[in-house]
């Protein structure tokens, strides 16, 4: 509360996250023409990626391009992109929405239509949705724990989220445990009354609010985090503003002499510890 | 502007970015001692990387050292590096500028000059400049859309930059379209009075500033950003500071059983969005 | 100092860093049954990786566990997890300590300990204690260079904390060259009150602060930074709330058409740049 | 020591059985994964089959997954190879060796992660 004799002081907040999980993974898996149930287990090392304190990623979807090679071929059919004739390619342009540049010829994509040629990454990447349910929806289940240092210089004082008569065991919950910093993610999204399962598909972004409301003062003094939780990512996005969140990433590889890639679509929940409040002293 | 009878509080703000855009690169490959030119195609899982919501980069340019082995080997003959006899080499020491560790050897590294032999990734990387115009120079033509949610906790209040009624084929014009989030990466440089082209052959750090000023009161609610854009690293920058902005990293990959690896020097742009402003009500 | 006629803005900050340093790592190379020493050079692109503006990372000792592909294998045995029957392994779950699923069987480990069956990347992490002393212990002689720009946008005014006049060859001392923006990782550690060595075998957060106070009125005009130096992370913390830094990240790799990975847990020393301050004008 | 013998090898008919034993001593050879190779003639040896120390998980070549079977007696220091459903392209000689390592989960089919072949025993399939 605003206590106006205090002098107020914004806090200086530093972010330490460690994700904790396996997923197990079956998907249709084709080699030799043959298609099969595959089985694959994720861990962290598989799932997410050694990013920035204030931010954390959780893989929770992908689809896979495999064994790209730089050469031409024909771009993928989506609405709008099918030709009939070389008149509607044009030579050296770059569609935003496709993955080359185009040579000018019309060429056969499959037996019935026939796509512009461009030069790319071949083949071009199958803008197919994303699997559903998503194929790392077991993730739900991962617990992230969560360590935060803050400091007030201008009152020279320091402190953290997590006290020494903590238990490594426990996990939050608004009423039972609400100092416990360790999190699972599933109880992160029914907290903030949005459905894993669903975002999973998709991906999108969740903010972990921690606010420090400190009073310094000798006689009152109290500086514990509150933790609440928000969607950031807006679930009635427009497509042609990308909803969900993913991005692409590539594994390069040589074979016989010719570098190709895996090119891995990625969807998942980036977690966005947000940091905020004062500390004031009289 | 400020209004004296309002409570003011600082911006709790998230940042997504998606860049869109290909590249079409030509440079000289040497394979088995014939140079040709190579053309290839990049896209953003090529020239740009996972990073955090505040910042993304995109790769502009870059210089290669291909099959890099640990091994025994000259060092690069930058000025001051040459050596006549082996008095001039120091087992054991480092030179910063150097990539490896002196073996105390005086070696020939080519018909003309002698340098100290070092235990590195041979054969060392050469300190040639940054290709000249940038490699991606075309990445002047690529897009960037931003979405930006903020929050005044104290206010309750939640918005974003992005809303319902707006069109996702729309580009940033600071007059014709200035609420517009899809932003073309030479007009920001336009706009901050810069030369991509130029630029682009060092690298360098690019500000996009957000700034929200928003009166939350119901009777004269205003609350939309403002976008302005500044270059951040120091074009006039002394040599020995490092100018423009650059990273090295490495492909690592096994060949007849010897662990090898290509070291990619990056030049690019890093783009910080720095967002700010506050939220103020009666 | 405070003064109260003025109006007071908080910074607005970017940061750039490039670090520098080689490291010759000893340590312990099994081949074909054979164990002898081997010798390995680390540059930047093998112990940092291209991350955001406010924080990098500094890798100081490393685990692998080399060729983990996906089959079943016997778990590690780490404290309570040997079994003695079948009884003791249940089908599908998930242990968060462990790194697979179990099958349910109880299977030999090595001759003395049996320990659950798990769906893993095999064979699984042996829990072993980071190598003591740190393998790239010598990090403590790298230097890293910070260049910050910071900027006031209601005063309309902008600085940096390297000045033309600066020399790129200094390094920063709190008595003899306090403005020197380039920093030994060990002199950061020394004026932390923190000892390097001990640090750099389980990894940490080190927090590099830099305080602007800054007056910028034209009579009495100052706007220098101020640096200063803390831990971050906890070291007197608990064995459950996972103390030091470290992360674990795979490469993965294909042999005889067999998806293989090898899996590197990287301790190091996380470096958090903390930009705070204000400018006051009349 | 270790001395890897080979034992079992001769001519059978296409369709036909034969089971290859390998003794070893020297030295116990029950910490180790252990494995069949074979070689043609005018052809490089090639991995066949392979079993880890403990007798739990066992690894084949696509072409006798199914028809082949590896096995162990640590009790006895003894490997096996039960071979049914043979067919002329398994005519070669068959070596056992010993697993050296590291990490037999990856390397369970590369030749040089072995060591001490034995002198090897001929299996010859006529159709």
């Known amino acids: 509360s605003d206590k106006l004799y205090q002098r107020k002081e914004p806090v200086i907040s530093s972010v330490h996250t460690k994700v904790k999980g396996i997923a197990e993974v079956t998907e249709n898996v084709t080699e030799g023409g043959v298609t099969k149930l595959g089985h694959s287990i994720f861990d962290t090392a598989d799932y997410t990626f050694p990013l920035q304190g204030n931010s954390f990623f959780v893989m929770t979807n992908y689809v896979k391009s495999e064994g790209q090679v730089q050469t031409l071929c024909p771009e993928y059919p989506r609405r709008g992109a099918q030709c009939s004739s070389d008149r509607r390619c044009k030579k050296g342009w770059m569609d935003p929405q496709s993955k080359g540049i185009q040579t000018g010829r019309c060429v056969p994509y499959d037996k019935t239509r026939k796509t512009c040629e461009v030069s790319a990454w071949c083949p071009t990447e199958e803008e197919k949705e994303a699997p559903r349910p998503a194929l790392l929806r077991s993730a739900e289940n991962f617990t992230v724990l969560i360590k935060n240092n803050i400091h007030f210089p201008g009152h020279n004082y320091t402190t953290r989220n997590i006290l020494p008569t903590m238990n490594g065991s426990c996990t939050f919950h608004k009423t039972w445990d609400p100092q416990c910093s360790i999190f699972r993610l599933g109880d992160i999204f029914q907290e903030a009354g949005e459905n894993f399962t669903e975002v999973a598909v998709q991906g999108g972004i969740m903010g972990i609010e921690i606010y420090w409301d400190c009073n310094l003062d000798s006689w009152s003094h109290h500086c514990r985090p509150r933790y609440s939780f928000r969607r950031l990512d807006d679930k009635n996005m427009d497509e042609s503003f990308v909803p969900g969140y993913n991005f692409r990433y590539a594994k390069y590889y040589k074979e016989n002499n010719v570098e190709k890639r895996t090119l891995i679509k990625a969807f998942g929940i980036r977690f966005d510890i947000l940091v905020f409040g004062t500390g004031g002293k009289f | 502007s400020d209004k004296l009878y309002q409570r003011k509080e600082p911006v709790i703000s998230s940042v997504h970015t998606k860049v869109k855009g290909i590249a079409e690169v030509t440079e000289n490959v040497t394979e088995g001692g014939v140079t040709k030119l190579g053309h290839s195609i990049f896209d953003t899982a090529d020239y740009t990387f996972p990073l955090q919501g505040n910042s993304f980069f995109v790769m502009t340019n870059y210089v290669k050292s291909e099959g890099q082995v640990q091994t025994l080997c000259p060092e690069y003959p930058r000025r001051g590096a040459q050596c006549s006899s082996d008095r001039r080499c120091k087992k054991g020491w480092m030179d910063p500028q150097s990539k490896g560790i002196q073996t105390g050897r005086c070696v020939p590294y080519d018909k003309t000059r002698k340098t100290c032999e070092v235990s590195a990734w041979c054969p060392t990387e050469e300190e040639k400049e940054a290709p000249r115009p940038a490699l991606l120079r075309s990445a002047e033509n690529f897009t960037v859309l931003i979405k930006n949610n903020i929050h005044f906790p104290g206010h309750n209040y939640t918005t974003r930059n992005i809303l319902p009624t707006m069109n996702g084929s729309c580009t940033f014009h600071k007059t014709w379209d200035p609420q517009c989030s899809i932003f073309r990466l030479g007009d920001i440089f336009q706009e901050a009075g810069e030369n991509f082209t130029e630029v682009a052959v060092q690298g360098g750090i690019m500000g996009i500033e957000i700034y929200w000023d928003c009166n939350l009161d119901s009777w004269s609610h205003h609350c939309r950003p403002r976008y302005s854009f500044r270059r951040l690293d120091d074009k006039n920058m002394d040599e020995s500071f490092v100018p423009g902005y650059n990273f090295r990293y490495a492909k690592y990959y096994k060949e007849n059983n010897v662990e090898k690896r290509t070291l990619i020097k990056a030049f690019g742009i890093r783009f910080d969005i720095l967002v700010f402003g506050t939220g103020g009500k009666f | 100092s405070d003064k109260l006629y003025q109006r007071k803005e908080p910074v607005i900050s970017s940061v750039h860093t490039k670090v520098k340093g080689i490291a010759e790592v000893t340590e312990n190379v099994t081949e074909g049954g054979v164990t002898k020493l081997g010798h390995s050079i680390f540059d930047t692109a093998d112990y940092t990786f291209p991350l955001q503006g406010n924080s990098f990372f500094v890798m100081t000792n490393y685990v692998k566990s080399e060729g983990q592909v996906q089959t079943l294998c016997p778990e590690y045995p780490r404290r309570g997890a040997q079994c003695s029957s079948d009884r003791r392994c249940k089908k599908g779950w998930m242990d968060p300590q462990s790194k697979g699923i179990q099958t349910g069987r109880c299977v030999p480990y090595d001759k003395t300990r049996k320990t659950c069956e798990v769906s893993a990347w095999c064979p699984t992490e042996e829990e072993k204690e980071a190598p003591r002393p740190a393998l790239l212990r010598s990090a403590e002689n790298f230097t890293v260079l910070i260049k910050n720009n910071i900027h006031f946008p209601g005063h309309n005014y902008t600085t940096r904390n390297i000045l033309p006049t600066m020399n790129g060859s200094c390094t920063f001392h709190k008595t003899w060259d306090p403005q020197c923006s380039i920093f030994r990782l060990g002199d950061i550690f020394q004026e932390a009150g923190e000892n390097f060595t001990e640090v750099a075998v389980q990894g940490g957060i080190m927090g590099i602060e830099i305080y602007w106070d800054c007056n910028l009125d034209s009579w009495s005009h100052h706007c220098r930074p101020r640096y200063s130096f803390r831990r971050l992370d906890d070291k007197n913390m608990d064995e459950s709330f996972v103390p030091g830094y470290n992360f674990r990240y795979a490469k993965y790799y294909k042999e005889n058409n067999v998806e293989k990975r090898t899996l590197i847990k990287a301790f190091g020393i996380r470096f958090d740049i903390l930009v705070f301050g204000t400018g006051g004008k009349f | 020591e270790v001395q890897l013998v080979e034992s079992g090898g001769g001519l059978v008919q296409a369709g036909g059985s034969l089971r290859l034993s390998c003794a070893a001593s020297?030295?116990?050879?029950?910490?180790?994964?252990m494995g069949w190779f074979r070689q043609a003639p005018g052809k490089l040896r090639e991995f066949v089959a392979s079993i880890n120390w403990s007798g739990i998980y066992t690894r084949y070549i696509d072409s006798v997954e199914g028809r082949f079977t590896i096995s162990r007696d640590n009790t006895k220091n003894t490997l096996y190879l039960q071979m049914n459903n043979l067919k002329a392209e398994d005519t070669a000689v068959y070596y056992c060796?010993?697993?050296?390592?590291?990490?037999?989960?990856?390397?369970?089919?590369?030749?040089?992660?072995?060591?001490?072949y034995g002198q090897g025993t001929q299996v010859t399939v006529s159709s």
């Open positions: 020297g030295r116990t050879v029950s910490d180790y994964g």
């Open positions: 060796a010993y697993f050296l390592g590291p990490n037999w989960y990856s390397n369970y089919g590369r030749p040089s992660s072995y060591d001490f």
